[in-house]
Interface confidence: low
Amino acid sequence: EPPTACREKQYLINSQCCSLCQPGQKLVSDCTEFTETECLPCSESEFLDTWNRETRCHQHKYCDPNLGLQVQQKGTSETDTICTCEEGLHCTSESCESCVPHRSCLPGFGVKQIATGVSDTICEPCPVGFFSNVSSAFEKCRPWTSCETKDLVVQQAGTNKTDVVCGPQDRQR
């Protein structure tokens, strides 16, 4: 009775179970009644990352510098190349096929989390007592100046975009 299912790391073909090729190797010919599955290693620029019956290896991903990409981890015969973005850029998707510049936080917003090669800048509104008067991908909200510690008084209140303006205390004559 020919098999209808095969063990792990095998596949069914022509009513018999053949061994899959191990990661890093491709199928050259199926097994027969008399011969084992024939596999060949992937070439230097190729990979296969699973037990497989693929007749060719996949090309390593190309990290295209024209798209702002650079190699984070070189591929092996069993793993694909991992791309990341150059300084100041981050990936547009999980597969990192292209890059875009990091977002800047507008005045009134500060950086909550600085961007990485794979994630964009996260901005947050400056809460009361803090301000940001610049558009920046790095600056956090800064606290208003404390006039009191300088023996000064607040002459103009601060906002989320401007610092307080301090001035001398009125001296009573």
Epitope: T55, R56, Q59
Partner: antibody, heavy 118, light 108 residues
Framework: QVQLQESGPGLVKPSETLSLTCTVS????????WSWIRQPPGKGLEWIGS???????NYNPSLKSRVTISVDTSKNQFSLKLSSVTAADTAVYYC????????????WGQGTLVTVSS | EIVLTQSPGTLSLSPGERATLSCRAS???????LAWYQQKPGQAPRLLIY???SRATGIPDRFSGSGSGTDFTLTISRLEPEDFAVYYC?????????FGGGTKVEIK
């Protein structure tokens, strides 16, 4: 736009070796698999084999003992040799470029008819 | 090797009609690995559909592909005069890649 052009003798004697060359223009031969496919007059298509620009080959088991495919990256060409031909090898021979990860063929030459006859 | 059987062998239809072509595989083929080609007399085949349902560059949307496992279909929603040709399916999952015997779509 990639273009492929087959060249070689249109008539080959039985038992001799059929030799064809495919010249690739409009793009580099590097980074792709390149295939030979044939079609006997009035019949269907048969994949003969393919080669990667690095020289790694795959052949159809039904023809494997008689087929050699080679590549010359400096000339942007790849070639087919089929030995010990018979009248059954009379066909239009096409060269084609494979897609990136799969063996289907987005680009084809126009084909060249090879007749095996004495 | 995987054998692909195409039916019907010949389909006689008029321009404007819908054409449905079948391709049956002798064993299961993941839809990622199935393609369709069109061939006109004296010309090389042209890739129409890959991955069972994705249209190749420049192919009009009247061509569509579907199916999975062992049964695949190419549909031409409204036949244009230039669509009368022979159509081949191809599987590229298992070594060696194989083509179906073709379906000729002819003018009725």
């Amino acid at each position: 736009q990639v273009q492929l052009q087959e060249s070689g003798p249109g008539l080959v004697k039985p038992s001799e070796t059929l030799s064809l060359t495919c010249t690739v223009s409009g793009g580099s031969i590097s980074s792709y698999y390149w295939s030979w496919i044939r079609q006997p007059p009035g019949k269907g298509l048969e994949w003969i084999g393919s080669i990667y620009y690095s020289g790694s080959t795959n052949y159809n088991p039904s023809l494997k003992s008689r087929v050699t495919i080679s590549v010359d990256t400096s000339k942007n060409q790849f070639s087919l040799k089929l030995s010990s031909v018979t009248a059954a090898d009379t066909a239009v021979y096409y060269c084609a470029r494979d897609a990136n990860y799969y063996k289907w063929h987005p680009y084809w030459g126009q084909g060249t008819l090879v007749t095996v006859s004495s | 090797e995987i054998v692909l059987t195409q039916s019907p062998g010949t389909l006689s239809l008029s321009p404007g009609e819908r054409a449905t072509l079948s391709c049956r595989a002798s064993q299961s083929v993941s839809s990622d690995y199935l393609a369709w080609y069109q061939q006109k007399p004296g010309q090389a085949p042209r890739l129409l559909i890959y991955g069972a349902s994705s249209r190749a560059t420049g192919i009009p949307d009247r061509f569509s592909g579907s199916g999975s496992g062992t049964d695949f279909t190419l549909t031409i929603s409204r036949l244009e005069p230039e669509d009368f040709a022979v159509y081949y399916c191809q599987q590229v999952l298992s070594y060696p890649p194989t083509f179906g015997g073709g379906t000729k779509v002819e003018i009725k």
